[in-house]
């Protein structure tokens, strides 16, 4: 099967690579404009340069292109607790990221939010923290995992899902009620 | 068994208002993030808010931020999303989800769903 092509793949394709076709005159291909720059004017004819210019502070483009516009620099989102790690440039976008110690939990694609990494008080570590992915915990006797952090088993009532790990516990405590906390 | 059980859905003109309710069971509510999924007809699934255990943390996806508001009662082990000025783009089947946190975008577990219909 054929992948269906956008109008611009199309016209595209009919040129050698590094090249477009003019948007006007499709006998005429025109040099892409590099990295860094956006397309000003096409091409005035065969061989003759495509007028592109520096994109302008505060935008950028990442790759070989004929955008009429350079894009926009991305933001790095404070109230997610990002921090940038390189600024944009000419011809790379923003780079956000997290604090050290903390991990990144994606809402969307393209938009995470940062939180920190867990301890593992009470506990040993069983996978260290990594940039997309919680510290995984082993708690130690007498203490559960909950929401990957180790909390003592005197916080565990009969009904909630901590009583198989501190079942020794729970048995011990004679003639408590059972609270029906869920 | 987690049980997540959603209400408050239906038809609202464009402006109006809704709140969603989720009633959970089965798991320690007070322990979890919780939020709410939607998935608008042929579209993929999207966060459209979250809540902390403690509810001292938010998120809002930016298309509701200021519009909408999350919020939960612990007490009552119940999630709720009050929607104002709904636009014709927030139709969907809103869900009540066990926020999974690490990686994703992910959608943790989640209820049966409720429908809100936007329309004139």
């Known amino acids: 099967l054929v992948p269906h092509l956008g109008d611009r793949e199309k016209r595209d394709s009919v040129c050698p690579q590094g090249k477009y076709i003019h948007p006007q005159n499709n006998s005429i291909c025109c040099t892409k404009c590099h990295k860094g720059t956006y397309l000003y004017n096409d091409c005035p004819g065969p061989g003759q340069d495509t007028d592109c210019r520096e994109c302008e502070s505060g935008s950028f483009t990442a790759s070989e292109n004929h955008l009429r516009h350079c894009l926009s620099c991305s933001k790095c989102r404070k109230e997610m607790g990002q921090v940038e790690i390189s600024s944009c440039t000419v011809d790379r976008d923003t780079v956000c990221g997290c604090r050290k110690n903390q991990y990144r939990h994606y809402w969307s694609e393209n938009l995470f939010q940062c939180f920190n990494c867990s301890l593992c008080l009470n506990g040993t570590v069983h996978l260290s923290c990594q940039e997309k992915q919680n510290t995984v915990c082993t708690c130690h006797a007498g203490f559960f995992l909950r929401e990957n952090e180790c909390v003592s088993c005197s916080n565990c009532k009969k009904s909630l899902e901590c009583t198989k790990l501190c079942l020794p516990q729970i048995e011990n405590v004679k003639g408590t009620e059972d609270s029906g906390t869920t | 068994e987690v049980q997540l059980l959603e209400s408050g859905g239906g038809l609202v003109q464009p402006g109006g208002s809704l709140r969603l309710s989720c009633a959970a069971s089965?798991?320690?509510?007070?322990?979890?993030?919780m939020g709410w999924v939607r998935q608008a007809p042929g579209k993929g699934l999207e966060w459209v808010s979250a809540?902390?255990?403690?509810?001292?943390?938010?998120f809002y996806a930016d298309s509701v931020k200021g519009r909408f508001t999350i919020s939960r009662d612990n007490s009552k082990n119940t999630l709720y999303l009050q929607m104002n000025s709904l636009r014709a783009e927030d139709a969907a089947v809103y869900y009540c989800?066990?926020?999974?946190?690490?990686?994703?975008?992910?959608?943790?577990?989640r209820g049966q769903g409720t429908l809100v219909t936007v329309s004139s």
């Open positions: 989800a066990k926020v999974k946190l690490g990686g994703g975008p992910n959608f943790g577990y």
């Open positions: 809540i902390s255990g403690s509810g001292g943390s938010t």
């Open positions: 089965g798991f320690t509510f007070e322990w979890y993030w």
